[in-house]
């Protein structure tokens, strides 16, 4: 029963992680303009994402522009886009694998196979979490490096945007959820060992025999 609870918690966490990951990838808030100079009057804030950039005026009016050419984009942005999409697809695949092996489904009857599918889905979710983490950490590293680079102009410096925090949360949830799913079925499934114990214990006596009780004809 506890195993089923862990599975449900694991899959709920991964679903939350997936939604967070989707929002993180979609929102244009990976990098936010950092106005540091004390003589600068802030008239607008610039948000930059994987797919578009937005300018928020002091009046509250927001204008967004989708990036035009894929080939003209920086390679790190292209890589971040690709990893984000792959991470989301991998997590979806993990969900399908989980559903096939979930206790409440009849896709697979054999308990061993179910446990293996749940374990596989857990591993897939962990992979998805790692894939989500890579572009987020890479972008954060670039922002921090720029921030402390004395030759990067203040106007070019950025701050960590909300999408990065969502990305970290998404990654954490996917890793945690995937980890829980992996833990619900140790060594080929949580039900495996106790199931075999029960089967074999019926043919064995309640108390073990001493050496003198074994038939001597079996010994040379």
């Amino acid at each position: 029963m506890a195993s089923a609870g862990m599975q449900i918690l694991g899959v709920v966490l991964t679903l939350l992680g997936w939604v967070n990951g989707l929002v993180s990838c979609a929102l244009p808030m990976w990098k936010v303009t950092a106005f540091i100079g004390n003589s600068i009057v802030v008239a607008q804030v610039v948000w930059e994402g994987l797919w578009m950039s937005c300018v928020v005026q002091s009046t509250g009016q927001m204008q967004c522009k989708v990036y035009d050419s894929l080939l003209a984009l920086p390679q790190d942005l292209q890589a971040a886009r690709a990893l984000c999409v792959i991470a989301l697809l991998v997590a979806l695949f993990g969900l399908l694998v989980y559903l096939a092996g979930a206790k409440c489904t009849t896709c697979v009857e054999e308990k061993d196979s179910k446990a293996r599918l749940v374990l596989t889905s857990g591993i897939v979710f962990v992979i998805s979490g790692v894939l989500t983490l890579i572009p987020v950490c890479w972008t954060a590293h670039a922002i921090i490096r720029d921030f402390y680079n004395p030759l990067v102009a203040e106007a070019q410096k950025r701050e960590l945007g909300a999408s990065l925090y969502l990305g970290w949360a998404a990654s954490g949830l996917l890793l945690l959820g995937g980890g829980l799913l992996c833990c619900t079925c140790p060594s080929g499934g949580s039900q495996g060992p106790s199931h075999y114990m029960a089967r074999y214990s019926t043919s064995a006596p309640a108390i073990s025999r001493g050496p003198s009780e074994y038939p001597t004809k079996n010994y040379v």
Partner: antibody, heavy 119, light 107 residues
Amino acid sequence: EVQLVESGGGLVKPGGSLRLSCAASGFTFNDYTMSWVRQAPGKRLEWVVTISSGGGRTYYPDSVKGRFTISRDNAKNSLYLQMNSLRAEDTAVYYCIRGDYRYDAFAYWGQGTLVTVSS
Amino acid sequence: DIQMTQSPSSLSASVGDRVTITCRASENIDSYLAWYQQKPGKSPQLLVYASTLLVDGVPSRFSGSRSGTQFSLTISSLQPEDVARYYCQHYYSEPYTFGSGTKLEIK
């Protein structure tokens, strides 16, 4: 108009010391990162040192680390470069440079001051 | 240290010609590259930063581009006042190094 005027250059013997100054005008000095870049005769430009706007952070390449010290006096709108243990390879024109709010890298250059290290 | 290899070392072209100077970084520097123009007897002047962005007041005939670790400065139509030495410089990480320069002359 941004003005950067270097002074303090001259002839010095190997192992000697020299202090370069840069007088800044036409902008709010304490808002900007400042640097020194040098150019040996007929050679490529070489970054020497950078100091943050407040003076709290300094950046040096290995070639001058431990020998050169950058400092600034924001009240006097002045930048300084203290050069110790000078070598023949330090012979160059030394440029005082101001960073910019909008532009990366070395945005505004002074006219330079010549430092000659020779016995 | 990141090495900047600039080519050609010198270049002679006619007024109106399209001229391209290239600079290759020994490792990835993203777009952290600047181009400078140094006229004879003068201090260098910043032309381009972030590999493609033109400084205000620089004629639009100048343009910068990037392809991986190779960077280019192009003058679409060479003018007599463009006679100078051009330097590239990376500012990806310390130490910030310059290219060896390209001397541009008019034929």
